[in-house]
């Protein structure tokens, strides 16, 4: 008897996550059943289901499967965090490359090679043809998207709309193109699920056909999601265990990637003295730790045994006994000669000067001539040349070309935090330039703090839902959860985009990250029809010294009565004095038994001057910063409020005009709180929703 | 009044498998997170995990995932912690502590001596 | 890991006195730092969260200061009550972790 084949590798699954339809119209199907692997075998053969499955659901708790024609990409769907949930999706649905020939590719790609719009499969216009949907059932030829029904030499192609064109292939790369990787590849976190030769890969949360002990949930950090190739064991290159049992593992072809492509785990910039960022490319020889302990050497196992070898980290440097950051860590480190301390920190090396000696700009850099073309966080400026279509979008004067000259650092825009340049980087189109305002400079980027010149409202009214405005309604207000629990507190500003503090993100991997919109309690608890869990697929920190973040959702937030965003308020605008406003948050409260109920604090806005005096001369304000004190004695943004907003009405409308980050002590009596003035870094903020990639509804 | 009550002093041989509690009273029992922390006779403390009661979400610390396991019950408001195999360097006082958010770990349990010895 | 360096391991100090413990992180915890105060065979108790904000019903001779690094509690005029070790902690970042404790005895 044939064994059936074990189709759940072809699911990339998201733990602890759903779906839910808003669609009433899609359709689902379930069934009780022991295992996700009898729902993935069932979904690929489409077996007594009356759709073509895309994705499916196990529910361990009632060991149930939901079959779904629809994936987390369609429309009328939405993701949710549910701890009895994991979800998966066929990786032929949600691919955007081909494997081989392309037979299996489903993608949504309809346009072809030269550009020409694919005519649909179901239609006869403008070409005759024998390939119908019905004709060619589980081979997906769906609307007009490219396919390869036969599996013919030259990948997936479709019939055109131009009657001139019978067909034409699709230009859609290669799996293998697309991937790619840097050194060997122990940061790899792609998409590659075949080996060179051509052998799926075994899921690593599975022990069949090849036991073994690369358990996702032991080894949490090093990506092992689904059956992708990775390198967690310093081997010269990604691999996997294969699901041919004679064969246990294989090397995977992922090619290396070319100069020019950057990813968050290429080293920047290489120093010896200094650190820049996080200290990924510093070749110095300092050998001991911030306490004085001394380095091991990296090519020893005593006194501590471990993998960070110079064998294993082929790109890292990993010399001597010198503090390296092979791993991404916060700072170079290095393992220690002390048996008793494993690890320690190189805190001593300091951070590389960010005015590059005599190097500086006066106001706000518009003037800059300097020639340093490289962005704070090391990547090398593009052309301005190459950039002037995307300029003038978010320009509405034509820039001084001569200024424009190379790839320097400038400032075309006005932009009020200093010289920048586009990067060439997708991920980064463009960022500030590491360059300070030149000492003694004390020309003002807004005028007039004081006095209310412009006014922070838009002159448009408060969205109102039948009928009624909605004043009490507080659906911007975001929950960050690191590793599921309350972190902090963030504004939507926009569908795709959440507004934060830096400190709100004590770790680098973003999987670790969710953000829970729509919900009054803090753990959900009755919060169930209205949350919206999104996870985040990039952070955007601000100008130097803002302490703010945009983060990215991974996908738009669906705007519905639950999640609403909020306003940002006029670039440089003043709240006059006394104005009521107010702080959100499910931070501390001081109350011995908190319910996790979303808690309010009101607030009223106080002069940069008189709130100075409040903080007895200690705090000197400036124009990024905006100040509130307490109507009640002892209220106020505490730990879990930070990163949430200080909200003000004005003409009926509301505006974040704060963000709370922490500062000096929780709710002190008669210490008004100090909040990253919005207004100060608005215009950053549009260019950022301007100018960033953001996923498509 | 708050308080957190744990289970009685326990003495174990290697090998053996154990469970201890923690009751909460006077407060949301599935607002706040209950956190384990070991003292070693001497010593220091040592975070090993925490469990959000309503959901039963776990994160531990590297160095005690795999020995312990840590859970609760919502129903009767009672968080634990088990070994289903105890080793001699398990013999430490046990401490559960709520925190609902940052550092705030504001009661403590009065603590469960754990003593494991052949 | 991050480490948490306290120091002095132990000190002597009569009452009345002022006494100062510092504990260093190894890296940024931004000021998600707390001091705890233990008694032979009690559990320790929370004297101060969020590095400065001291808990309900503690005493106003404790204090805390510091962020990002480097953190400080500082006791204004000993009291016999308030010889004990004490401990800071880190709860920024998973796992969290403690410093290795100060104990504070009689002169």
């Known amino acids: 008897q044939r064994k059936r084949r074990n189709t759940i590798h072809e699911f990339k699954k998201s733990a602890k996550t759903t779906l839910i339809k808003i669609d009433p119209a899609l359709k689902i199907k379930t069934k009780k059943v022991n295992t996700a692997d009898q729902c993935a075998n069932r979904c690929t053969r489409n077996k007594g289901l009356p759709f073509t499955c895309k994705a499916f659901v196990f529910d361990k708790a009632r060991k149930q499967c939901l079959w779904f024609p629809f994936n987390s990409m369609s429309s009328g769907v939405k993701k949710e965090f549910g701890h009895e949930f994991d979800l998966y999706e066929n990786k032929d649905y949600i691919r955007n490359c081909i494997i081989g020939k392309g037979r299996s590719y489903k993608g949504t790609v309809s346009i072809t090679k030269s550009g020409i719009k694919c005519q649909p499969w179901s239609s006869m216009i403008p070409h005759e043809h024998s390939f119908l949907p019905s004709s060619y059932r589980g081979k997906d030829l769906q609307e007009n998207y490219c396919r390869n029904p036969r599996g013919e030499e030259g990948g997936p192609w479709c019939f055109t709309s131009n009657p001139e064109v019978r067909y034409e292939v699709c230009d859609i790369p290669q799996c293998s193109e697309v991937e790619c990787m840097t050194c060997n590849g122990e940061s790899y976190r792609g998409l590659m699920d075949h080996t060179e030769s051509g052998k799926i890969c075994q899921r690593w949360d599975h022990q069949t056909p090849h036991r073994h002990k690369f358990l996702p949930e032991r080894y949490p950090d090093k990506g092992f999601d689904d059956n992708y190739c990775r390198n967690p064991d310093g081997q010269p290159r990604p691999w996997c265990y294969t699901l041919d049992p004679h064969t246990r593992w294989e090397y995977c072809a992922i090619k290396t990637c070319a100069d020019n492509t950057m990813n968050d785990t290429d080293v920047p910039l290489e120093t010896t003295e200094c650190i820049q960022g996080q200290g990924e490319g510093y070749r110095g020889t300092v050998n001991t730790i911030w306490n004085g302990i001394p380095c091991q050497r990296w090519d020893s196992q005593y006194p501590h045994e471990h993998d960070m070898t110079p064998e294993n980290f082929k790109c890292k440097d990993l010399r001597e006994n010198y503090c390296r950051n092979p791993d991404g860590s916060e700072s170079p480190w290095c393992f220690t000669t002390d048996p008793n301390i494993r690890v320690g920190y190189c805190s001593q090396i300091p951070n590389c000067d960010m005015s590059h000696g005599q190097d500086c700009y006066r106001g706000n850099g518009k003037n800059y001539m300097g020639n340093l073309s490289q962005t704070r966080s090391g990547l090398t400026c593009s052309m301005w040349d190459k950039n002037m279509e995307d300029l003038h979008r978010h320009i509405f004067w034509e820039p001084d070309a001569s200024k424009l000259n190379e790839n320097y650092c400038r400032n075309p825009d006005d932009d009020a935090h200093g010289p920048w340049c586009y990067t060439g980087n997708p991920l980064i189109p463009w960022d500030y330039c590491p360059i300070s305002r030149c000492e003694g400079d004390t020309t003002p980027t807004i005028v007039n703090l004081d006095h209310p010149v412009i006014s922070c409202a838009k002159t448009k009214q408060l969205r109102v839902v039948n009928g009624i405005p909605t004043r009490t309604n507080i659906g911007w207000m975001v929950s960050l959860r690191y590793r599921n629990k309350h972190i902090c507190g963030g504004s939507l500003i926009k569908e795709s985009w959440v507004l934060t503090a830096r400190q709100c993100f004590p770790s680098r991997d973003l999987k670790d990250y969710e953000a829970w919109l729509g919900i009054h309690d803090v753990h959900g608890r009755g919060d169930e029809k209205c949350k919206q869990v999104l996870n985040v697929s990039q952070l955007v920190y601000g100008p130097e010294g803002s302490d703010l973040v945009l983060m990215k959702l991974a996908r738009p937030a669906v705007l519905d009565d639950f999640v609403s965003t909020i306003d940002l308020p006029n670039y440089g605008c003043t709240i006059p004095e006394k104005t009521s406003c107010s702080v959100y948050g499910w931070g501390y409260t001081g109350l011995i038994n908190y319910d996790g109920l979303l808690r309010v604090a009101h607030l009223y806005i106080m002069g940069n001057e008189k709130c100075s005096q409040h903080h007895r001369g200690k705090v000197t304000l400036n124009e990024s910063e905006i100040c509130a004190g307490a109507e009640k004695i002892g209220s106020g943004p505490c730990e879990g409020d930070y990163g949430g907003p200080l909200v003000c009405e004005q003409h009926k409308m509301r505006m974040v005009l704060g963000v709370i980050v922490p500062g000096r002590g929780c709710a002190i009596p008669n210490r008004p709180g100090i909040f990253v003035r919005v207004a100060y870094y608005a215009k950053w903020i549009h260019k950022i929703i301007l100018t960033y990639k953001v996923p498509q509804s | 009044e708050v308080q957190l009550v744990q289970s009685g002093a326990e003495v174990k041989k290697p090998g053996e498998s154990l469970r201890i509690s923690c009751k909460g009273s006077g407060y949301s029992f599935t607002t706040y997170w209950m956190h384990w922390v070991r003292q070693m006779p001497g010593k220091g403390l040592e975070w090993m995990g925490e469990?959000?009661?309503?959901?039963?979400?776990?994160n531990y610390n590297p160095s005690f995932q795999g020995h312990v396991t840590i859970s609760a019950d919502k129903s009767i408001s009672t968080a634990y912690l088990q070994w289903s195999s105890l080793k001699a360097s398990d013999t430490a006082m046990y401490y559960c502590?709520?925190?609902?958010?940052?550092?705030?770990?504001?009661?403590w349990g009065q603590g469960t001596l754990v003593t494991v010895s052949s | 890991d991050i480490q948490m360096t306290q120091s002095p391991s132990s000190l002597s100090a009569s009452v009345g006195d002022r006494v100062t413990i510092t504990c260093k992180a190894s890296e940024n915890v931004v000021s998600y730092v707390s001091w705890y105060q233990q008694k032979p065979g009690k559990a320790p108790k929370l004297l101060i969260y969020g590095a400065s904000n001291r808990n309900t019903g503690v005493p106003s001779r404790f204090s805390g200061s510091g962020s990002g690094t480097d953190f400080t509690l500082t006791i204004s005029s000993l009291q016999p009550e308030d010889f004990a070790t004490y401990y800071c902690?880190?709860?920024?970042?998973?796992?969290?972790?403690f410093g290795q404790g100060t104990k504070l005895e009689i002169k």
């Open positions: 469990i959000n009661p309503t959901n039963g979400h776990t």
């Open positions: 902690g880190q709860s920024y970042n998973y796992p969290y972790t």
């Open positions: 502590a709520r925190n609902y958010v940052g550092s705030i770990f504001d009661y």
